[in-house]
Structure formats: C-alpha cells, structure tokens
Amino acid sequence: GITSINCSGDMWVEPGEIFQMGMNVSIYCQEALKHCRPRNLYFYKNGFKEEFDITRINRTTARIWYKGFSEPHAYMHCTAECPGHFQETLICGKDISSGHPPDAPSNLTCVIYEYSGNMTCTWNTGKPTYIDTKYIVHVKSLETEEEQQYLASSYVKISTDSLQGSRKYLVWVQAVNSLGMENSQQLHVHLDDIVIPSASIISRAETTNDTVPKTIVYWKSKTMIEKVFCEMRYKTTTNQTWSVKEFDANFTYVQQSEFYLEPDSKYVFQVRCQETGKRNWQPWSSPFVHQTSQETGKRNWQPWSSPFVHQTSQTVSQVTAKSSHEPQKMEMLSATIFRGHPASGNHQDIG
C-alpha cells in the first residue's frame, strides 16, 4: 500500500478510507502544485488508470465515483497533467478498504486440557470482515468482580495461574472493527467443570486363538481424574458405519476391552473420554488399526446376531462417517441402540 507518500495536494474519501463493502464511494483529489495549472486530473486504482465516472469539480479538484465498491483493498492515487511536462505529476495517494462489521462471536467454548496449565477458549468469528478486526476476550470473576481482557483472533489460551482468585467466571468475546462492534453471549464457567482428561491412547490390540476369537484392546491415559466416562468406536476399514461402546474407566491401570469381531478383517479403533457427568469430550484418539486373525472354523457368524451376546449395562450404538476421508467427523446414524456383551470370558471392559 501507499504508506508514506509526499503529497502535492490532498486526497480524501467519502464516506471514509474504511467503509462497508458494497457502498457507493466518492474519492476526491485536490492539487496544490506549484507552477502548474493542470489540464487534467487522473485517478489510478491499483496502478491502472480509471476512465469512467470522473468529474472535474473546479480548477484544482476532481472526483471519481464508484457504485457499489466491493474490493477489500485498493491503492488509489491521482496525478495532474501539467502543461509543458512530459510525464504526469503525482498529487497524492491513499489506501482504501472495504469490509463488514463483525458478526457476534458464536459458539464460545472454554476448556482446560488436563496438565496444560491453560484455559483455552474458542469461538466462531462468523463471516469474513476483510478489515482489521480485534477480538477481546473478557474474563470476569463472579466472586471478586475483577475483569481480565485478552486480545485474540479466533482463540485464546489463558494461564490458569491468572485464574487462582476464583473458580467461577463469566466469559464473553467482543469483536471490534472500524465498522462496528458485537458481543458474544456470556458463558458461565466453573473451572472444575471444564477439565478434559489427559489424552487417551490405544497402546495395542491382540486377537486370541479361542474357538470364538476375541480381540482385546489395551488403552491408557495419564489422567488424575478418578471418575472418567469413555467411548470407543470401531469399524472395519471398508465400512462407513462405526459401532460405539461405552465404558466407565479407572486409569490407575491399563484398560482392557474385549470385542468379538469379524475374522480376517482390518479394524480401526478410536477412544475418547470425559470427566463423568461433564460435557467436554477429548478429541478422538489417533486411529489404531488392528487385523483380526483368520477364521479357523467354517462358521460364518454375524456379530449383531451372535449367540455369544447377552444384555449388560454397556451400550453399543452405531454411527456413520460423513466421509470416508474424514473419520473425525461423525453423526448419529440412528436412534437404535444395541446393548450387548459377549457372554463368555472375563469381562474387563468396565474399569
């Protein structure tokens, strides 16, 4: 852009150098050249001479008019054609910007990842503004009434050291630019309610050589949270549909979960956990791929109609991936819930 230019006159913009996208805009150029009575005044946008909608107002001043200006940024300058001069003479230049006032930030969420030492808040900024927009995160203690403010773009990490005076806070985000200001809805935060347990990891899996082979998945977390509720989802690599098993976990020892799966198939497993009774989940763990062993007998059995299943308190449901390329984005396939568990073997699924 044109940051520092020695002007021999003036250039100004109505309604202003930053304006709402789609507005009609007038740009004025007024020369103050010594020894020049300009024959013509010319406007340039991004280095290209403009031909239309230019009005000479008087001897020193001209105006260019744009209907519905919709470029986010433009570099304008104007020149004079002085008699006896071979080249045009620069008068002045301006950076102009068009954009939108900010949307109210939405979907404000704050979590504390265990051991991170930070409260991380994220939000949706809404549609692009195209101009410099600041986001101010306000964190107000409901006990001391003191307020902290943080500058951010689309998320903020706030050290929990600075949140020691209180457990309960009011958090909101203010979006500000030169065209407007909007506030998000306020979020009531209790620090004890927003902790996400330390990452859960599937460490290994093995399939036994029993008459009815079973797959045991071993998984762990370094969490110090005592009551943890987890979900493990699994599917064959060729399938779109995930099955989900739920567990109450106690991570003082490695978790073992048993599955009766199709033989000679490649399965993907993922796990995620939350503090029991809280709403914030870990992201799904990295996909863990396991190949079940080849079938020894001739029986072709269906896991959903297996005689080896009986009712327990565990829940298995089915979800489907929106895209085979995006295993992280899931949606519930149906409300049908299959509650089932293999009847044989030691049940070590629940902590």
Epitope: I136, Q149, Y150, I158, S159, S162, V176
Partner: nanobody, 118 residues
Framework: QVQLQESGGGLVQPGGSLRLSCATS????????MTWVRQAPGKGLDWVSG???????VYADSVKGRFTISKDNAKNTLYLQMNSLKTEDTAVYYC????????????TGQGTQVTVSS
C-alpha cells in the same frame, strides 16, 4: 477503588526520548489489561498502545517501532518508553485500565503533558 497516576512527561526536542510511568492501585494489576491514550491540543482521545492480561502488546500505526509499553507487576506500574519523538506526539498522555477498543478502557488519572518542540 481504581487509582492511576501518570508521570514522566516534559519538554523534549524532536528525535528525543521520554519514559512515562503510571502508578496504579485498587485492582489486581498483574492480570489487568492496560492502555496508554493521548489527547493532542484541540483533538479527541486517541489510543497509543495497549497490553492485555496475558502480556500481548499492540501499538497504533503512528507509534509502531518507536514506542514500547511494559508492566512491572512488582511495582504495580505501567510504562511507556517513547523514542524518536516527533512534534505530532505532543499531547497529554493518560494511562487507562482495559484495552483500546470497544469502550473497554477507563481512565482516572490527571495525565502527563508531553511537548515535542525544537
């Protein structure tokens, strides 16, 4: 209640330096966001620089690269180091709680006069 007291202004030649201080009390300074604003003769208040609760700093384009904002939490004091001063920096400088935008800042001090003149 929040109290702010600016000091360190004076008369200086173009190209010179000054360091402004703002002594604070009545709130938890270490986690408070702070701003320097100024008012030139016959003009409105303009923000100069800000520091958020996490220590992120911001500067107005007109002072970027010349001014530096900082905090001393042990002394509950905000500073503005002003180098390469220009005549257009002449103003009364105020410190304020909060950040520069969105009506979030409040000033209670009397300000300190900075005059840049040869």
């Amino acid at each position: 209640q929040v109290q702010l007291q600016e000091s360190g202004g004076g008369l200086v030649q173009p190209g010179g330096s000054l360091r402004l201080s703002c002594a604070t009390s009545g709130f938890t300074f270490s986690s408070g966001a702070m701003t320097w604003v100024r008012q030139a003769p016959g003009k409105g208040l303009d923000w100069v620089s800000g520091i958020d609760s996490g220590g992120t700093t911001v500067y107005a384009d007109s002072v970027k690269g010349r001014f530096t904002i900082s905090k001393d939490n042990a002394k509950n004091t905000l500073y503005l180091q002003m180098n390469s001063l220009k005549t257009e920096d002449t103003a009364v400088y105020y410190c304020a709680t909060g950040l520069p935008w969105g009506n979030t800042w409040r000033t209670t001090g009397q300000g300190t006069q900075v005059t840049v003149s040869s």
